[in-house]
Interface confidence: low
């Protein structure tokens, strides 16, 4: 009798396990707000999807607590170094939690890509990739920030993106 | 009686779940064809393996539909910037599907690595990493392309590679 | 009787599957030993954790054999190119196994980041990310090495890190 009862529970758990939370969000024309806020993302069109995670104002929102591999790539590019542009670009994944008023740095990279351009008219490209495992509680959110976001180059959702899956 | 019958099915599913599809393919001397096609990969020797995925002419072939984290790294290097070499190198993962005649861009990076070399005799190295979750149907294929592939530096399979696993 | 017996085994396996091995280790002030050994890591504080893996002198130690996605990122930075510094930085993940006396290269990147600095007083930043799937036996270890480690920039555990999870 026990096994049969447990059986239903296991079947149920196995079915829910089928939808291991995962998401891949893609860059879009609206990604760069210029407002100092995080990047915004496409959640449905093309390669973008949400499965067992939700989205709100640039943030992946966790519905099931656990360890997640989170990742983001941003495509950077420019012509020379724009006036007033810091020589350092910071690309990071940050956590927002209801229990704490400030965002928490999770994974961060600093790069000096436009130092590659030896003349002011030289076109340059660079890419920054971040990925790592973090523990996230239900209701916590992860966002991507790039400073200076003026150097993020969007095109078709394949060059700048943001995703996660439970491990 | 039902539970016992379902039991066999679950055991079967669990066993198949043991072999969660995964692969890691490594760069080899034969990887760079110079033909304009995708990179070719080692599938068996050394660190390379296929588990629940197959391989054909440079492509990882999906046998079980689902969401996959796919990744690739390529090691780039050179001495100065070869004559006629575009200042931009594009490294990408592309999908081939029976339902569509052209390859579809999945994850792409552009870099200007040899802009780092301030003189024509300066040796430079750079690396490009891509990774992200995409949905793949059975029979669909993923390939890696690098333009200009003349800058890909192969050695022992640890510096340029291509892989995937179901999430 | 068989199904009931197998049932206990499956429940047991399912429970152990709950704790799918995973770890994320973070950079700390003690990471850089200057001894020529691998980087050392924080295993408990902040974002760092071990789940189903153990740690010893810079190494992630495997307790359950299987395929693992292993990854590392290091933050590099400097002012110009220090005297005597090789223009190439090598960042790699290496395996130690009881069956073999030498470390085995798993995933490696070479970069020439300080070539970006066009003057000796120019500050530059770069980041190197590695990730890939490898098979690891129980008792085998994975370490991170950076040559020249003088260019690794530590801060708060978000910029340089090392992790793994079973796939």
């Amino acid at each position: 009798d026990g096994p049969a009862g447990s059986w239903e529970q296991l079947i149920q758990e196995r079915r829910s396990h089928e939808v291991n939370p995962a998401a891949h969000l893609t860059g879009a024309n609206s990604s760069l707000t210029g407002s100092g806020g995080p990047l915004l993302w496409e959640t449905q069109l093309g390669l973008a999807f949400l499965r067992g995670l939700s989205y709100h104002d640039g943030a992946l929102v966790v519905t099931k607590a656990g360890y997640y591999y989170i990742y983001s790539k941003v495509q950077l590019g420019g012509v020379g170094c724009p006036l007033g542009l810091a020589s350092t670009i910071t690309h990071g994944l940050y956590k927002r939690t209801p229990r704490y008023p400030e965002e928490l740095e999770l994974l961060v990279s600093q790069q000096s890509p436009c130092g590659r351009a030896t003349s002011s008219s030289r076109v340059w490209w660079d890419s920054s990739f971040l990925g790592g495992v973090v523990h996230l509680e239900a209701g916590e959110e992860v966002v991507v920030r790039v400073l200076d976001e003026r150097l993020v180059r969007l095109r078709d959702g394949t060059r700048s993106y943001f995703g996660a899956f439970m491990v | 009686d039902g539970p016992a019958g379902s039991w066999e099915q679950l055991i079967q599913e669990r066993r198949s779940h043991e072999v969660n599809p995964a692969a890691h393919l490594t760069g080899a001397n034969s990887s760079l064809t110079g033909s304009g096609g995708p990179l070719l990969w080692e599938t068996q020797l050394g660190l390379a393996f296929l588990r629940g995925l197959s391989y054909h002419d440079g492509a990882l072939v999906v046998t079980k539909a689902g969401y996959y984290y796919i990744y690739s790294k390529v090691q780039l290097g050179g001495v100065g910037c070869p004559l006629g070499l575009a200042s931009t190198i594009t490294h990408g993962l592309y999908k081939r599907t029976p339902r569509y005649p052209e390859e579809l861009e999945l994850l792409v990076s552009q870099q200007s690595p040899c802009g780092r070399a301030t003189s024509s005799s300066r040796v430079w190295w750079d690396s490009s990493f891509l990774g992200g979750v995409v949905h793949l149907e059975a029979g669909e294929e993923v390939v890696v392309r690098v333009l200009d592939e003349r800058l890909v530096r192969l050695r022992d399979g640890t510096r340029s590679y291509f892989g995937a696993f179901m999430v | 009787d068989g199904p009931a017996g197998s049932w206990e085994q499956l429940i047991q396996e399912r429970r152990s599957h709950e704790v799918n091995p995973a770890a994320h280790l973070t950079g700390a002030n003690s990471s850089l030993t200057g001894s020529g050994g691998p980087l050392l890591w924080e295993t408990q504080l902040g974002l760092a954790f071990l789940r189903g893996l153990s740690y010893h002198d810079g190494a992630l130690v495997v307790t359950k054999a299987g395929y693992y996605y292993i990854y590392s990122k290091v933050q590099l930075g400097g002012v110009g190119c220090p005297l005597g510094l090789a223009s190439t930085i090598t960042h790699g993940l290496y395996k130690r196994t009881p069956r073999y006396p030498e470390e085995l290269e798993l995933l490696v990147s070479q970069q020439s980041p300080c070539g970006r600095a066009t003057s000796s007083s120019r500050v530059w930043w770069d980041s190197s990310f590695l990730g890939g799937v490898v098979h690891l036996e129980a008792g085998e270890e994975v370490v991170v090495r950076v040559l020249d480690e003088r260019l690794v920039r530590l801060r708060d555990g978000t910029r340089s890190y090392f992790g793994a999870f079973m796939v």
Epitope: T33, G34, G36, G37, D57, R96, P101, E103, R145, L147 | - | -
Partner: antibody, heavy 124, light 112 residues
Framework: QVQLQQSGPELVKPGASVKISCKAS????????MNWVKQSHGKSLEWIGR????????FYNQKFNNKATLTVDKSSSTAHLELLSLTSEDSAVYYC?????????????????WGQGTSVTVSS | DVVMTQTPLSLPVSLGDQASISCRSS???????????LHWYLQKPGQSPKLLIY???NRFSGVPDRFSGSGSGTDFTLKISRVEAEDLGIYFC?????????FGGGTKLEIK
């Protein structure tokens, strides 16, 4: 309660620079944007830009790109506006103002608290 | 930049009267997240601006219910149902949907 206390009036010569401050209290300084707004005598308001104290992210109204520099000192919960190469056109009252950092549905999206203003007079 | 146009420039009223101020934007103010970031401020003589209404129609904390906001797209209105002496001053509309933030030219509410 939320308070933004600005530094006192400034009389400066043309071509000089001036740095005014805005000390925040009563809330988590790093958790909100700090905006700066210019009001010339008898005129409307002009948004100069804003800074996110947590990360140092800044965004400027292009009109003030080479005129204003925004900085923060997190240790003292103080934001600064530096005005460069001053001319008579820069004579105005400058306000700091807080806005929430997410633009979330539960937030106002507006500058919800303002400092009392700092008068800057440029005259030889 | 988004231009915010307020009318009238000056609005003479008697205490107890209803007052209505209009604000028109040169482009739509609906953000990609669905919110409309149109706000109203009151600046009394010698003081800094104070937030009255945010996101078109939401009263900020401590603001009396005689103040109400409405509108959509590019046309917005602030109404004061019964003007009191403490309501006199200059009213500004502002948008924070698009960067840079911009303000209207102001409407001076004064005693008739």
């Amino acid at each position: 309660q939320v308070q933004l206390q600005q530094s006192g009036p400034e009389l400066v010569k043309p071509g000089a620079s001036v740095k005014i401050s805005c000390k925040a209290s009563g809330y988590s300084f790093t958790g909100y944007f700090m905006n700066w707004v210019k009001q010339s005598h008898g005129k409307s308001l002009e948004w100069i830009g804003r800074i996110y104290p947590y990360s140092g992210d800044t965004f400027y109204n292009q009109k003030f790109n080479n005129k204003a520099t925004l900085t923060v000192d997190k240790s003292s919960s103080t934001a600064h506006l530096e005005l460069l190469s001053l001319t008579s056109e820069d004579s105005a009252v400058y306000y700091c103002g807080r806005s929430e950092h997410f633009g979330r549905n539960y937030g106002t999206g507006a500058v919800d608290y303002w400092g009392q203003g700092t008068s800057v007079t440029v005259s030889s | 930049d988004v231009v915010m146009t307020q009318t009238p420039l000056s609005l003479p009223v008697s205490l107890g009267d209803q007052a209505s101020i209009s604000c028109r934007s040169s482009q739509g103010l609906v953000h990609s997240n669905g919110n409309t970031y149109l706000h109203w401020y009151l600046q009394k003589p010698g003081q800094s601006p104070k937030l009255l209404i945010y996101k078109v129609s939401n009263r900020f904390s401590g603001v009396p219910d005689r103040f109400s906001g409405s509108g959509s797209g590019t046309d917005f209105t602030l109404k004061i149902s019964r003007v009191e002496a403490e309501d006199l001053g200059i009213y500004f509309c502002s948008q924070s949907t698009h960067v840079p933030y911009t303000f209207g030219g102001g409407t001076k509410l004064e005693i008739k």
